[in-house]
């Protein structure tokens, strides 16, 4: 499907508006520190060039690859070395090494100021004054903070962002209309970013085979009526889409995603009965809807799995002839029968099955050797079931905030070397599994909980990779993608950790805490809790609870005081002394 000019091809396929938006996202994800105006200038230059290629595909440079064109453009940025340091060395390389170099310098935790939401009237004025710039700025700010955000999905978020302002800036109570919508977009956006980050980590750290296995399991759960060949085709196409997006090939990714949505909708009769509504929507909504569509009903009277995968005399022959296809069939058949299992559990079962066949098919009596393979699955299934049961009970007993605190303590004791902000962020997100999943019936709890935990633990893994401080984190993150959660669950208190020196400054609070939102106040308290555990890793739950209760009372008291700052200074000293005594510091 060769085109004389790739840039012209993508411009024509995507249209000018999407082309410009995707180039802006691509540039902001690569050069995360560059000012907005510089990016807009680069995007306009690329767009004008693309238009010349649409007019004449044989024009000069129109035959160059997108990586060459975009890389050349990024390398014209004057302040590259001052702003990005060694990333500037990428520009001395040729493609494809130059693009790989840019990818390696993407920063999951860029040193950027927190996005502060202006007053509603200020936002509405900015929106009305220059809608185009306002929306571009949204794309830019999200993309630079989330360098792996799924670009075609970000276009969908931007469309909803625009719709929110269009509707609410005309409303009688603008704030009441707009703020909940913006909160929802922010929360959904963070979740979407984290889910995509796991897909990219899966592809980049564990390879295409790992991603395809994940996709076979998930699509088989979602489309249990589809034939294996159909699922395989969807997996191949989906893998191409995500490989492109994770590799920075955003134009190709968006174009291929649109083609995939078109194919799914044209073939919904052989895929799923749940796609009808999705397929009536416009492109961006359609693709989003398909990605989130509920599982179809399982076909009635599916035969036992044992017939083809244990009892058949052809198991080893079939496995030897096409190992990955046979394992793919196993995964497909198991997953379509088990929407109640997490994808990672299904992958663990497939791995166990593979390991058994590798061993048994080379044995003297293969069938005798693998006859009981399904019995090996039982403990693998029970482990997450029990863990979820215990943690949902704890969540229901404590509520979200205190459940997060329990996880903060648990994880700080496991990996105390990890930075406090990372421990707070990750543990807070781990704690959200309770309100997200524990409300579900048994049949939906495990896929909700364990697959969500995989996303959150991947955040820990990518943040830790930037500044590795714990061999235990590195080990759990790199050994096996599907066993990350069991690996972290199995970690006990790190006995090798030397407690942090006590620093009173860490526990000094000021009146500004009183004006913070409830969420920000929780984060302050949780930060203090992590620091406490780092000082006293052997502190008991009761000791920590007592100190935290005292701390909460102290904040409440001083925030009610007339002279807040004095209260924080004097009462704070007393609290620190009492805490030290209580914990034996």
């Amino acid at each position: 499907d060769a085109h004389k000019s790739e840039v012209a091809h993508r411009f024509k396929d995507l249209g000018e508006e999407n082309f410009k938006a995707l180039v802006l996202i691509a540039f902001a994800q690569y050069l995360q520190q560059c000012p907005f105006e510089d990016h807009v200038k680069l995007v306009n230059e690329v767009t004008e060039f693309a238009k010349t290629c649409v007019a004449d595909e044989s024009a000069e440079n129109c035959d160059k690859s997108l990586h060459t064109l975009f890389g050349d453009k990024l390398c014209t940025v004057a302040t590259l070395r001052e702003t990005y340091g060694e990333m500037a060395d990428c520009c001395a390389k040729q493609e494809p090494e130059r693009n790989e170099c840019f990818l390696q310098h993407k920063d999951d935790n860029p040193n950027l100021p927190r996005l502060v939401r202006p007053e509603v009237d200020v936002m509405c004025t900015a929106f009305h004054d220059n809608e185009e710039t306002f929306l571009k700025k949204y794309l830019y700010e999200i993309a630079r903070r989330h360098p792996y955000f799924y670009a075609p999905e970000l276009l969908f978020f931007a469309k909803r962002y625009k719709a929110a302002f269009t509707e609410c800036c005309q409303a009688a109570d603008k704030a009441a209309c707009l703020l909940p919508k913006l909160d929802e977009l922010r929360d959904e956006g963070k979740a979407s970013s984290a889910k995509q980050r796991l897909k990219c980590a899966s592809l980049q750290k564990f390879g295409e085979r790992a991603f395809k296995a994940w996709a076979v399991a998930r699509l088989s759960q979602r489309f249990p009526k589809a034939e294996f060949a159909e699922v395989s085709k969807l997996v191949t196409d989906l893998t191409k889409v995500h490989t492109e997006c994770c590799h920075g090939d955003l134009l190709e990714c968006a174009d291929d995603r649109a083609d995939l949505a078109k194919y799914i909708c044209e073939n919904q009769d052989s895929i799923s009965s749940k796609l009808k509504e999705c397929c009536e929507k416009p492109l961006l909504e359609k693709s989003h809807c398909i990605a989130e569509v509920e599982n179809d009903e399982m076909p009635a009277d599916l035969p036992s799995l044992a017939a083809d995968f244990v009892e058949s005399k052809d198991v080893c022959k079939n496995y030897a002839e096409a190992k990955d296809v046979f394992l793919g069939m196993f995964l497909y058949e198991y997953a379509r029968r088990h929407p109640d299992y997490s994808v990672v559990l299904l992958l663990r079962l497939a791995k166990t099955y593979e390991t058994t066949l590798e061993k048994c098919c080379a044995a003297a009596d293969p069938h005798e050797c693998y006859a009981k393979v399904f019995d090996e699955f039982k403990p693998l299934v029970e482990e997450p079931q029990n863990l979820i049961k215990q943690n949902c009970e704890l969540f229901e007993q404590l509520g979200e905030y205190k459940f997060q605190n329990a996880l903060l303590v648990r994880y700080t004791k496991k990996v105390p070397q990890v930075s406090t902000p990372t421990l707070v962020e990750v543990s807070r997100n781990l704690g959200k599994v309770g309100s997200k999943c524990c409300k579900h019936p048994e049949a939906k709890r495990m896929p909700c909980a364990e697959d969500y935990l995989s996303v959150v633990l991947n955040q820990l893994c990518v943040l830790h990779e930037k500044t590795p401080v714990s061999d235990r984190v590195t080990k759990c993150c790199t050994e096996s993608l599907v066993n990350r959660r069991p690996c972290f669950s199995a970690l006990e208190v790190d006995e090798t950790y030397v407690p942090k020196e006590f620093n009173a400054e860490t526990f000094t609070f000021h009146a500004d805490i009183c004006t913070l939102s409830e969420k920000e106040r929780q984060i302050k308290k949780q930060t203090a809790l992590v620091e406490l555990v780092k000082h006293k890793p052997k502190a008991t739950k009761e000791q920590l609870k007592a100190v935290m209760d005292d701390f909460a009372a102290f904040v409440e008291k001083c925030c009610k005081a007339d002279d807040k700052e004095t209260c924080f200074a004097e009462e704070g000293k007393k609290l620190v002394a009492a805490s030290q005594a209580a914990l034996g510091l």
Partner: nanobody, 123 residues
């Protein structure tokens, strides 16, 4: 493009031996399982033997077990079939084959196959 070229066939007396070879190209041989199938005059395709990508797993049809040995050399992109104690009923065209994406496992008509090499066993 996938190419499989068989050689080593010929005429042999009952109880004799032959070694068939199959040179492969156009695909990643070292990650592909390989198969020998045969077609006797006027009959359909019959599976003979399979060897896994790393040669750890070998499987044989009951009719050839103990007489035939499949092997491979990944450095040479070649698969072999050592045939001993040959019988009249082993007379057939022998094909080397490998799985073709999208086909059903064991549906040898749909696999990539070579042009075959004729083995004739007669007194």
């Amino acid at each position: 493009e996938v190419q499989l070229v068989e050689s080593g066939g010929g005429e042999v007396q009952p109880g004799g031996s032959l070694r068939l070879s199959c040179a492969a190209s156009g695909f990643t041989f070292s990650t592909s399982g390989m198969v020998w199938v045969r077609q006797a005059p006027g009959k359909g395709l019959e599976w003979v033997s399979t060897i896994s990508d790393d040669a750890r797993i070998t499987v044989y049809a009951e009719s050839v077990k103990g007489r035939f040995t499949i092997s491979r050399d990944n450095a040479k992109n070649t698969v072999y079939l050592q045939m001993n104690s040959l019988r009249a009923e082993d007379t057939a065209v022998y094909y080397c084959a490998t799985y073709r994406a999208g086909s059903r496992i064991g549906s040898y008509e749909d696999y990539y196959r070579g042009q075959g090499t004729l083995v004739t066993v007669r007194p």
